[in-house]
Amino acid sequence: QEGPLPRPSISAEPGTVIPPGRPVTIVCRGPVGVDQFRLEREDRSKFNDTKDVSQASPSESEARFRIDSVSEGNAGHYRCLYVKSTRWSEHSDYLDLVVKETSGDTDSPVTEPDSSAGPTQRPSDNSHNEHAPASQGLSAEHLY
Protein backbone atom coordinates (compact mmCIF):
# COMPACT_ATOMS: atom_id res chain seq x y z
CA GLN A 1 0.00 0.00 0.00
CA GLU A 2 1.42 3.35 -1.04
CA GLY A 3 1.73 6.05 1.60
CA PRO A 4 -0.21 9.29 1.51
CA LEU A 5 0.70 11.81 -1.15
CA PRO A 6 2.36 14.98 0.12
CA ARG A 7 0.07 17.96 0.51
CA PRO A 8 0.34 20.61 -2.18
CA SER A 9 1.20 24.20 -1.41
CA ILE A 10 -0.55 27.31 -2.71
CA SER A 11 0.62 30.88 -3.21
CA ALA A 12 -0.29 33.95 -5.22
CA GLU A 13 1.77 36.29 -7.40
CA PRO A 14 2.28 39.16 -6.90
CA GLY A 15 0.46 38.66 -3.57
CA THR A 16 -2.85 37.90 -1.93
CA VAL A 17 -4.14 41.49 -1.80
CA ILE A 18 -4.92 42.62 -5.34
CA PRO A 19 -6.55 45.86 -6.54
CA PRO A 20 -9.59 45.45 -8.79
CA GLY A 21 -8.71 45.14 -12.44
CA ARG A 22 -5.20 43.84 -11.79
CA PRO A 23 -3.96 40.35 -12.69
CA VAL A 24 -3.15 37.62 -10.20
CA THR A 25 -1.67 34.18 -10.68
CA ILE A 26 -2.38 31.45 -8.16
CA VAL A 27 0.44 28.91 -8.05
CA CYS A 28 -0.04 25.32 -6.91
CA ARG A 29 2.96 23.12 -6.17
CA GLY A 30 3.26 19.40 -5.63
CA PRO A 31 5.79 16.59 -6.01
CA VAL A 32 7.43 15.33 -9.18
CA GLY A 33 5.10 13.36 -11.46
CA VAL A 34 1.85 15.26 -10.93
CA ASP A 35 -0.49 14.71 -13.86
CA GLN A 36 -3.16 17.30 -13.04
CA PHE A 37 -3.65 20.16 -10.62
CA ARG A 38 -7.01 21.47 -9.47
CA LEU A 39 -7.74 24.88 -7.99
CA GLU A 40 -10.94 24.95 -5.92
CA ARG A 41 -13.02 27.68 -4.38
CA GLU A 42 -14.01 27.31 -0.74
CA ASP A 43 -17.35 25.61 -1.39
CA ARG A 44 -15.70 23.00 -3.67
CA SER A 45 -18.48 23.40 -6.23
CA LYS A 46 -16.32 25.64 -8.42
CA PHE A 47 -12.94 24.48 -9.63
CA ASN A 48 -10.46 24.73 -12.48
CA ASP A 49 -8.19 21.93 -13.72
CA THR A 50 -4.95 22.04 -15.63
CA LYS A 51 -2.53 19.47 -16.98
CA ASP A 52 -0.07 22.17 -18.03
CA VAL A 53 2.61 21.39 -15.47
CA SER A 54 6.10 22.88 -15.02
CA GLN A 55 9.22 21.59 -13.32
CA ALA A 56 9.45 24.03 -10.43
CA SER A 57 12.50 22.60 -8.67
CA PRO A 58 14.32 19.26 -8.35
CA SER A 59 11.62 17.98 -6.02
CA GLU A 60 8.54 19.92 -7.12
CA SER A 61 6.22 20.47 -10.04
CA GLU A 62 3.80 23.36 -10.32
CA ALA A 63 0.80 24.74 -12.15
CA ARG A 64 -0.28 28.33 -12.56
CA PHE A 65 -3.85 29.66 -12.63
CA ARG A 66 -4.04 33.19 -13.97
CA ILE A 67 -6.86 35.70 -13.58
CA ASP A 68 -6.33 38.63 -15.92
CA SER A 69 -8.47 41.18 -14.16
CA VAL A 70 -9.70 40.48 -10.66
CA SER A 71 -13.05 41.67 -9.36
CA GLU A 72 -14.90 41.31 -6.08
CA GLY A 73 -16.28 38.02 -7.35
CA ASN A 74 -12.78 36.55 -7.32
CA ALA A 75 -12.19 37.32 -3.66
CA GLY A 76 -12.35 34.39 -1.31
CA HIS A 77 -10.64 31.22 -0.20
CA TYR A 78 -8.83 28.97 -2.66
CA ARG A 79 -7.05 25.66 -2.25
CA CYS A 80 -5.21 23.19 -4.48
CA LEU A 81 -5.07 19.46 -4.90
CA TYR A 82 -3.54 17.22 -7.55
CA VAL A 83 -3.63 13.81 -9.21
CA LYS A 84 -0.60 11.56 -9.23
CA SER A 85 -0.72 7.93 -10.38
CA THR A 86 -4.53 8.15 -10.52
CA ARG A 87 -4.69 9.14 -6.83
CA TRP A 88 -5.94 12.47 -5.50
CA SER A 89 -3.87 14.27 -2.92
CA GLU A 90 -5.13 16.01 0.16
CA HIS A 91 -6.00 19.68 -0.16
CA SER A 92 -3.49 22.44 0.43
CA ASP A 93 -4.06 25.04 3.09
CA TYR A 94 -6.46 27.80 2.09
CA LEU A 95 -5.23 30.93 0.38
CA ASP A 96 -7.33 34.03 1.08
CA LEU A 97 -7.48 36.28 -1.97
CA VAL A 98 -8.44 39.83 -1.05
CA VAL A 99 -9.60 42.29 -3.71
CA LYS A 100 -9.24 45.87 -2.56
CA GLU A 101 -7.65 49.14 -3.50
CA THR A 102 -4.29 49.76 -1.92
CA SER A 103 -2.69 53.14 -1.46
CA GLY A 104 -0.76 54.40 -4.44
CA ASP A 105 -2.06 51.83 -6.88
CA THR A 106 -3.34 54.40 -9.32
CA ASP A 107 0.07 56.08 -9.39
CA SER A 108 2.37 53.05 -9.47
CA PRO A 109 1.35 50.12 -11.64
CA VAL A 110 1.83 46.62 -10.26
CA THR A 111 4.82 44.91 -11.83
CA GLU A 112 4.09 41.59 -13.47
CA PRO A 113 5.83 38.82 -11.51
CA ASP A 114 8.59 36.84 -13.14
CA SER A 115 7.48 33.27 -13.65
CA SER A 116 10.80 31.63 -12.90
CA ALA A 117 11.14 29.34 -9.94
CA GLY A 118 14.20 31.11 -8.64
CA PRO A 119 17.73 31.96 -9.65
CA THR A 120 19.23 28.61 -8.72
CA GLN A 121 16.72 26.42 -10.57
CA ARG A 122 16.26 25.44 -14.19
CA PRO A 123 12.53 24.92 -14.45
CA SER A 124 11.61 23.29 -17.73
CA ASP A 125 9.49 26.01 -19.20
CA ASN A 126 11.41 29.01 -17.95
CA SER A 127 14.74 28.10 -19.45
CA HIS A 128 13.83 30.04 -22.59
CA ASN A 129 12.72 33.62 -22.60
CA GLU A 130 10.56 33.19 -25.67
CA HIS A 131 6.90 33.87 -25.19
CA ALA A 132 3.93 34.29 -27.40
CA PRO A 133 2.52 37.81 -27.40
CA ALA A 134 1.07 38.67 -24.01
CA SER A 135 -2.31 37.27 -24.87
CA GLN A 136 -5.23 37.02 -22.49
CA GLY A 137 -4.70 34.78 -19.52
CA LEU A 138 -7.58 32.99 -17.87
CA SER A 139 -10.36 35.52 -17.46
CA ALA A 140 -12.39 35.73 -14.29
CA GLU A 141 -15.56 34.48 -15.96
CA HIS A 142 -13.71 31.46 -17.34
CA LEU A 143 -12.13 30.64 -14.01
CA TYR A 144 -15.31 30.42 -12.01
Partner: antibody
Protein backbone atom coordinates in the same frame (compact mmCIF):
# COMPACT_ATOMS: atom_id res chain seq x y z
CA UNK B 1 -10.04 7.93 -26.26
CA UNK B 2 -7.34 10.48 -27.02
CA UNK B 3 -7.03 11.10 -30.74
CA UNK B 4 -4.54 13.34 -32.53
CA UNK B 5 -4.76 13.55 -36.32
CA UNK B 6 -2.11 15.43 -38.24
CA UNK B 7 -2.58 16.80 -41.75
CA UNK B 8 -0.80 19.19 -44.08
CA UNK B 9 2.38 17.32 -44.90
CA UNK B 10 3.70 16.92 -48.41
CA UNK B 11 6.50 17.69 -50.82
CA UNK B 12 7.87 21.23 -50.78
CA UNK B 13 10.92 22.90 -52.29
CA UNK B 14 13.74 24.31 -50.18
CA UNK B 15 12.92 27.80 -48.83
CA UNK B 16 9.24 27.00 -49.23
CA UNK B 17 6.50 26.98 -46.59
CA UNK B 18 4.03 24.48 -45.19
CA UNK B 19 1.45 24.57 -42.42
CA UNK B 20 0.75 21.42 -40.43
CA UNK B 21 -2.50 20.94 -38.52
CA UNK B 22 -3.45 18.59 -35.71
CA UNK B 23 -7.07 17.89 -34.79
CA UNK B 24 -7.41 16.80 -31.17
CA UNK B 25 -10.32 14.92 -29.63
CA UNK B 26 -11.15 12.68 -26.69
CA UNK B 27 -9.71 15.00 -24.02
CA UNK B 28 -9.98 18.56 -22.74
CA UNK B 29 -7.64 20.25 -25.19
CA UNK B 30 -7.42 23.68 -23.60
CA UNK B 31 -5.93 22.49 -20.29
CA UNK B 32 -3.01 20.66 -21.92
CA UNK B 33 0.34 21.81 -23.22
CA UNK B 34 1.00 20.49 -26.74
CA UNK B 35 4.11 19.66 -28.75
CA UNK B 36 5.44 18.84 -32.17
CA UNK B 37 8.10 16.11 -32.39
CA UNK B 38 9.73 14.96 -35.61
CA UNK B 39 11.65 11.95 -36.87
CA UNK B 40 13.82 12.05 -39.98
CA UNK B 41 13.80 8.87 -42.10
CA UNK B 42 15.78 6.15 -40.32
CA UNK B 43 16.76 8.54 -37.53
CA UNK B 44 15.83 9.26 -33.93
CA UNK B 45 13.27 11.54 -32.32
CA UNK B 46 13.68 15.31 -32.12
CA UNK B 47 11.47 17.65 -30.11
CA UNK B 48 10.52 20.65 -32.26
CA UNK B 49 8.17 23.00 -30.39
CA UNK B 50 5.84 23.34 -27.42
CA UNK B 51 2.91 25.62 -26.63
CA UNK B 52 1.44 26.08 -23.19
CA UNK B 53 -2.10 26.96 -22.14
CA UNK B 54 -3.96 30.20 -21.62
CA UNK B 55 -3.02 30.11 -17.92
CA UNK B 56 0.58 30.45 -19.10
CA UNK B 57 -0.09 33.09 -21.76
CA UNK B 58 0.26 30.53 -24.56
CA UNK B 59 4.03 30.60 -24.06
CA UNK B 60 5.93 28.97 -26.92
CA UNK B 61 9.30 27.20 -27.04
CA UNK B 62 11.39 25.95 -29.95
CA UNK B 63 14.36 23.76 -30.75
CA UNK B 64 17.35 25.81 -31.92
CA UNK B 65 17.22 24.07 -35.29
CA UNK B 66 13.80 25.58 -36.12
CA UNK B 67 13.83 28.83 -34.17
CA UNK B 68 12.81 31.88 -36.24
CA UNK B 69 11.53 29.60 -39.01
CA UNK B 70 8.72 27.60 -37.37
CA UNK B 71 5.75 28.92 -35.38
CA UNK B 72 3.57 26.78 -33.13
CA UNK B 73 0.02 27.98 -32.40
CA UNK B 74 -3.28 26.64 -31.15
CA UNK B 75 -7.00 27.27 -31.43
CA UNK B 76 -8.66 26.09 -28.22
CA UNK B 77 -12.16 26.72 -29.54
CA UNK B 78 -11.56 24.20 -32.34
CA UNK B 79 -9.15 21.90 -30.44
CA UNK B 80 -6.52 22.45 -33.12
CA UNK B 81 -2.73 22.63 -32.99
CA UNK B 82 -0.68 24.14 -35.82
CA UNK B 83 2.91 24.33 -37.00
CA UNK B 84 3.73 26.99 -39.57
CA UNK B 85 7.02 26.07 -41.23
CA UNK B 86 8.83 28.71 -43.30
CA UNK B 87 12.19 28.77 -45.09
CA UNK B 88 12.22 24.98 -45.13
CA UNK B 89 15.52 23.13 -45.49
CA UNK B 90 16.27 19.62 -46.74
CA UNK B 91 17.13 18.63 -43.16
CA UNK B 92 13.53 19.38 -42.12
CA UNK B 93 12.44 16.27 -44.05
CA UNK B 94 10.77 14.07 -41.44
CA UNK B 95 7.62 12.60 -40.05
CA UNK B 96 6.01 15.25 -37.84
CA UNK B 97 4.04 14.11 -34.80
CA UNK B 98 1.52 16.06 -32.77
CA UNK B 99 2.02 15.11 -29.12
CA UNK B 100 0.18 15.81 -25.88
CA UNK B 101 2.53 15.68 -22.91
CA UNK B 102 2.02 14.68 -19.28
CA UNK B 103 3.88 15.48 -16.07
CA UNK B 104 5.35 18.60 -17.68
CA UNK B 105 7.19 17.11 -20.63
CA UNK B 106 6.82 13.34 -20.95
CA UNK B 107 5.34 12.67 -24.40
CA UNK B 108 2.31 10.55 -23.57
CA UNK B 109 -0.08 10.71 -26.53
CA UNK B 110 1.09 10.70 -30.14
CA UNK B 111 -0.69 11.18 -33.42
CA UNK B 112 0.09 8.96 -36.40
CA UNK B 113 2.21 11.70 -37.97
CA UNK B 114 2.30 13.57 -41.25
CA UNK B 115 5.24 13.31 -43.63
CA UNK B 116 7.14 16.37 -44.84
CA UNK B 117 9.66 16.10 -47.67
CA UNK B 118 11.82 19.08 -48.58
CA UNK B 119 13.47 18.52 -51.93
CA UNK B 120 14.14 20.31 -55.16
CA UNK C 1 21.32 22.05 -24.03
CA UNK C 2 21.30 18.76 -22.15
CA UNK C 3 22.76 15.89 -24.19
CA UNK C 4 21.27 12.43 -23.73
CA UNK C 5 23.57 9.52 -24.59
CA UNK C 6 22.47 5.94 -25.10
CA UNK C 7 25.79 4.10 -25.24
CA UNK C 8 24.61 1.18 -27.37
CA UNK C 9 22.82 1.89 -30.63
CA UNK C 10 21.83 -1.76 -31.00
CA UNK C 11 21.73 -5.01 -29.05
CA UNK C 12 21.47 -8.54 -30.35
CA UNK C 13 19.61 -10.54 -27.72
CA UNK C 14 17.83 -13.85 -27.25
CA UNK C 15 14.23 -14.35 -26.21
CA UNK C 16 14.00 -14.68 -22.44
CA UNK C 17 17.16 -12.65 -21.85
CA UNK C 18 17.36 -9.88 -19.30
CA UNK C 19 18.09 -6.65 -21.12
CA UNK C 20 19.48 -3.41 -19.71
CA UNK C 21 19.55 -0.17 -21.71
CA UNK C 22 21.43 2.80 -20.31
CA UNK C 23 20.98 6.51 -20.78
CA UNK C 24 23.31 9.22 -19.55
CA UNK C 25 22.49 12.92 -19.30
CA UNK C 26 25.16 15.59 -19.62
CA UNK C 27 23.95 17.09 -16.34
CA UNK C 28 21.58 16.26 -13.50
CA UNK C 29 17.99 15.94 -14.75
CA UNK C 30 16.43 15.23 -11.34
CA UNK C 31 14.55 12.09 -12.46
CA UNK C 32 12.70 13.96 -15.21
CA UNK C 33 13.33 11.06 -17.55
CA UNK C 34 10.98 9.19 -19.87
CA UNK C 35 11.48 5.97 -21.82
CA UNK C 36 9.74 5.22 -25.13
CA UNK C 37 9.31 2.11 -27.25
CA UNK C 38 9.01 2.42 -31.01
CA UNK C 39 8.25 -0.68 -33.05
CA UNK C 40 9.08 -0.67 -36.79
CA UNK C 41 6.55 1.43 -38.68
CA UNK C 42 4.78 2.49 -35.49
CA UNK C 43 4.42 5.61 -33.37
CA UNK C 44 6.52 5.92 -30.17
CA UNK C 45 4.84 4.75 -26.96
CA UNK C 46 5.56 6.16 -23.53
CA UNK C 47 6.66 3.34 -21.20
CA UNK C 48 8.06 5.08 -18.13
CA UNK C 49 8.03 8.61 -16.75
CA UNK C 50 9.79 10.20 -13.77
CA UNK C 51 12.57 7.61 -14.30
CA UNK C 52 10.68 4.80 -12.53
CA UNK C 53 6.90 5.19 -12.98
CA UNK C 54 5.42 2.59 -15.31
CA UNK C 55 2.63 3.89 -17.52
CA UNK C 56 -0.74 2.15 -17.39
CA UNK C 57 -0.84 -0.95 -19.57
CA UNK C 58 2.93 -1.40 -19.77
CA UNK C 59 3.95 -4.97 -18.83
CA UNK C 60 5.62 -5.37 -15.46
CA UNK C 61 8.71 -6.93 -17.07
CA UNK C 62 9.71 -3.33 -17.86
CA UNK C 63 11.23 -1.21 -15.11
CA UNK C 64 13.19 2.00 -14.83
CA UNK C 65 15.83 3.08 -12.37
CA UNK C 66 18.49 5.70 -11.85
CA UNK C 67 18.98 9.24 -10.61
CA UNK C 68 21.14 12.27 -11.25
CA UNK C 69 22.71 11.79 -14.69
CA UNK C 70 22.46 8.00 -15.06
CA UNK C 71 19.32 6.04 -15.89
CA UNK C 72 18.47 2.49 -16.89
CA UNK C 73 15.59 0.69 -18.60
CA UNK C 74 15.41 -3.01 -17.75
CA UNK C 75 13.43 -5.88 -19.27
CA UNK C 76 13.42 -8.99 -17.11
CA UNK C 77 12.60 -11.52 -19.83
CA UNK C 78 12.62 -10.40 -23.45
CA UNK C 79 9.53 -11.32 -25.47
CA UNK C 80 9.24 -11.25 -29.24
CA UNK C 81 6.88 -8.24 -29.04
CA UNK C 82 9.63 -6.25 -27.28
CA UNK C 83 11.71 -6.06 -30.46
CA UNK C 84 11.81 -2.29 -31.01
CA UNK C 85 13.93 0.80 -30.66
CA UNK C 86 13.99 2.37 -27.20
CA UNK C 87 14.55 6.07 -26.58
CA UNK C 88 15.17 8.05 -23.42
CA UNK C 89 14.15 11.70 -23.09
CA UNK C 90 14.80 14.36 -20.49
CA UNK C 91 12.10 16.87 -19.59
CA UNK C 92 13.88 18.73 -16.84
CA UNK C 93 14.58 21.67 -19.08
CA UNK C 94 13.73 22.97 -22.52
CA UNK C 95 14.84 22.11 -25.14
CA UNK C 96 13.59 18.61 -24.39
CA UNK C 97 16.15 16.16 -25.74
CA UNK C 98 16.08 12.48 -26.70
CA UNK C 99 18.79 9.87 -26.68
CA UNK C 100 19.83 8.44 -30.03
CA UNK C 101 17.93 5.21 -29.47
CA UNK C 102 18.84 1.59 -28.78
CA UNK C 103 17.55 -1.04 -31.20
CA UNK C 104 16.85 -4.52 -29.84
CA UNK C 105 17.25 -7.33 -32.36
CA UNK C 106 16.78 -11.06 -31.92
CA UNK C 107 19.86 -13.27 -32.34
Amino acid sequence: EVQLVETGGGLVQPKGSLKLSCAASGFTFNINAMNWVRQAPGKGLEWVARIRTKNNNYATYYADSVKDRFTISRDDSESMLYLQMNNLKTEDTAMYYCVRDRYGGAMAYWGQGTSVTVSS
Amino acid sequence: DIQMTQSSSSFSVSLGDRVTITCKASEDIYNRLAWYQQKPGNVPRLLISSATSLETGVPSRFSGSGSGKDYTLSLTSLQSEDVATYYCQQYWTIPYTFGGGTKLEIK
